[in-house]
Structure formats: structure tokens, C-alpha cells
Amino acid sequence: SGTTNTVAAYNLTWKSTNFKTILEWEPKPVNQVYTVQISTKSGDWKSKCFYTTDTECDLTDEIVKDVKQTYLARVFSYPAGNVESTGSAGEPLFTNARKFLPYRDTKLGQPTIQSFEQVGTKVNVTVEDERTLVRRNNTFLSLRDVFGKDLIYTLYYWKSSSSGKKTAKTNTNEFLIDVDKGENYCFSVQAVIPSRTVNRKSTDSPVECMGQEKGEFRE
């Protein structure tokens, strides 16, 4: 079955971070083009990246419609030209991607420390609430809006003068920690979804240290 001289796509891979979702595959096309279809388990197939010569397809627009749905996708291979001139043996070749559940499978992007403020022996560290491409009522939702209390942040902090790290956790985007007066501290945060079995943690944020721009200090 399949059309002559076409090769089925292989190595179909979902690449998804903070719901920005791209399906990638191989091989680079030679005398063929690809079309991707996506659907929910109960829905109709919708064609995307029609007759493309790329080996990736941005499916973000479709999966953000409902990030808690399960999505199916497949990649069709068509000969590069009409079938009458290239020869046909019925339906085109296609390859199924593995099921994709955005809420479960999207990776957490690297977080950013928005600010920190010291008041006496307390420091308030705020994590930037990153915007996603998920929409509700025509506005983009933040990561916290989407994941709610499923999302926590872990703060790693240490004295600039030593390497011993301490940790704190929060299910908001703010930490309030105790520090030693007169000491400078460095901070890094990590996003975590504890209920997940895979893709539980983001990479660590860039390190921010007291005595640099992002901080405010009040006695």
C-alpha cells in the first residue's frame, strides 16, 4: 500500500515547552511532501502544515484549545507532484505519533527570578509568572493560571561566601526566607510538578545574587 516512491515519516517526536508544541519527524523530503493531521480522541482529524517540505509542524494552536485533552497526530507522505504522473497504489503512507497530553507532557520552561527584596533578616524572592500560549477569554494564561496548585517552585539559596545550599518550596510564585544579616545570598529557582512521573522539573533558573540589579534592600 501507499504511493510509489514515497517514504513513511519516522522518529516522530513531540517537542513541547510551556505548551509551545511542535511535532518533528524524519526524513528530509526527497520528491515528497508531508501533511500533518491532529485530533482529540473523540474529534475529527484536522490537517495542518499542508503539503509541507518541512520536517516539523507547530501544533500549538490546536493543543492550547484544551490542554487537558489527549491528542493524536499523524504524518502523511505524498509524492511531490500529482499522483497520475508519479504512480499510485491507493492511500498515502502515514505514521502515527504517540499520544500527547499537553497538561502531562509539556516540559516546564526555565523559570526566571523576577525580583528579590530584603527587609532586615527576611528576603522575599519572586518568580516571574511566565505567560503561556494558552488562551481564555482572549487573554494568554500564565503558567500558574494553567497549573494552579499542581505547580510548585523550589528555591535554592546560599551565601555568596559558601557553597552550602538551602532549599525552600512554595505553591505560589513567592518565597519568604530567613537570612543572616550582613550576608549576601545567591538564588536559583526550579519549577516542579510533583504529581508527574516524567518531565517533573524544569532546568534551574539563572542565578541571581544580592548586590546585583534585581534586588532591593531595606533595613
Epitope: 501533511t35 507532484g81 492511500e91
Partner: antibody
Framework: QVQLVESGGGVVQPGRSLRLSCAAS????????MHWVRQAPGKGLEWVAV????????YYADSVEGRFTISRDNSKNTLYLQMNSLRAEDTAVYYC????????????WGQGTLVTVSS | DIVMTQSPDSLAVSLGERATINCKSS????????????LAWYQQKPGQPPKLLIY???TRESGVPDRFSGSGSGTDFTLTISSLQAEDVAVYYC?????????FGGGTKVEIK
């Protein structure tokens, strides 16, 4: 010789539906991708929709997505365009066209059928 | 979406003279793997459907007179009628078939001066 003959056009009120047909002859219909292209009176050409030779994949212009549905019946050598929720701006001559040497290159066109959306 | 911009909007040329129509795409329609430009030219006479003249930017469709030629690459393309004939009075459209949605230029009307 290759022939594409559209039918089903006419005057329709906004919000109503219409189904266009395109009867194909003179070639192996099931081997070719097919398109609908429209032309508003005195204006340029606008691509509307495409369907692959097998009928599995369909793609639409943003302006008609969710309102129009392209389909084909390879046993009847016929292409269709179901147009729902019609608007005044859908008023145009609708052409069916065949993929030629490559996808999206139209080597044969029908004569067109006029759709007028007016109250 | 790739935007196709044609110039001029209209053109009046004497019989036997050269007519040149330009078409610019908002992004390249050249596919590097096969070095082909995914651009076509059509001619449309009043009351008729368009007729394919040229594809791959410079390949003449079978039966099209050799006074019609296409050139250009990447984002800038030209259709040339080397010696205008009376039957060439029409509107000419460029179209990219590089990526969907397919898009046409706004058209150039060619008339006899």
C-alpha cells in the same frame, strides 16, 4: 479533454447555506488534488480550500475556516464545497481548479459559478 | 502567510513592444533542496477563468507562446511579454505555491497603448 463544470451558485441570504459542485471529466479524477478559488466582482483571486486526491486531507483559508467544507466523491468524479453561515463578503465567482505539475499549480479551471450573498 | 505584491497595477503598451510585470513575495519562495522557485503566473481575460502561463518561476506551460517568459528568484520575479499582441490584453496574476495558504498577487491589467 479535461473538463471541470461548476454548479450550485445563486443568490442566498446572509447566514444561509449553499452547496457547490464541480463535475470532472476527461482525466483520472481520483489521482489529482482539487481546489476551490474565488474571485469577488472586479477583484483578484483568492484561494479558498484544497483537498488531497484521496480525500483524507483538507485545508482552508482563514476567511472560510469553520464555515466551509470541501469534500469529494471519487466514484462520481465530483468535488463539493459546502458553504454555511454565508456572509456578504463571500459574494464571488467560485472556480474549481485541478492541481497540475505540482500541488497548487492549476493547469485546468472550471468556468466558475457565481454566488451572491444578499438580503 | 506569504504576501504577494504586484506592480504596476496597470500597464499600457504599444503592439509589438515589451511588457514587464513585477511580483514580490514577502518571504522567499525558493526551496533550497531542489533550487526551485514555487511561483506561477496566470493570465485572465474578461469573463474567463485564469489560464496557467508559467510555473517554477520560468517554465512555460505547454502551448503558451514563447513571447511569454518568467524570471527571478527568491522574492523578486518578473513576467515579460516580449512583443505584445492584441490577444494578450488581460489581467496577469502571480501566485506562490510554496506554502499554504496559497496566495495571489493583486493582478496587473495589461492594455494596448
Amino acid at each position: 479533454q479535461v473538463q471541470l463544470v461548476e454548479s450550485g451558485g445563486g443568490v442566498v441570504q446572509p447566514g444561509r447555506s449553499l452547496r457547490l459542485s464541480c463535475a470532472a471529466s476527461g482525466f483520472t479524477f481520483r489521482s489529482y488534488g482539487m481546489h476551490w478559488v474565488r474571485q469577488a466582482p472586479g477583484k483578484g483571486l483568492e484561494w479558498v480550500a484544497v483537498i488531497t486526491y484521496d480525500g483524507i486531507n483538507k485545508y482552508y483559508a482563514d476567511s472560510v475556516e469553520g464555515r466551509f467544507t470541501i469534500s469529494r466523491d471519487n466514484s462520481k468524479n465530483t468535488l463539493y464545497l459546502q458553504m454555511n453561515s454565508l456572509r456578504a463578503e463571500d459574494t464571488a465567482v467560485y472556480y474549481c481548479a485541478r492541481d497540475g505539475v505540482y500541488y497548487g499549480v492549476y493547469d485546468y479551471w472550471g468556468q466558475g459559478t457565481l454566488v451572491t450573498v444578499s438580503s | 502567510d506569504i504576501v504577494m505584491t504586484q506592480s504596476p497595477d496597470s500597464l499600457a503598451v504599444s503592439l509589438g513592444e515589451r511588457a514587464t510585470i513585477n511580483c514580490k513575495s514577502s518571504q522567499s519562495v525558493l526551496f533550497s533542496s531542489n533550487n526551485k522557485n514555487y511561483l506561477a503566473w496566470y493570465q485572465q481575460k474578461p469573463g474567463q477563468p485564469p489560464k496557467l502561463l508559467i510555473y517554477w518561476a520560468s517554465t512555460r506551460e505547454s502551448g503558451v507562446p514563447d513571447r511569454f517568459s518568467g524570471s527571478g528568484s527568491g522574492t523578486d520575479f518578473t513576467l515579460t511579454i516580449s512583443s505584445l499582441q492584441a490577444e494578450d490584453v488581460a489581467v496577469y496574476y502571480c501566485q506562490q505555491f510554496h506554502s499554504y495558504p496559497l496566495t495571489f498577487g493583486g493582478g496587473t491589467k495589461v492594455e494596448i497603448k
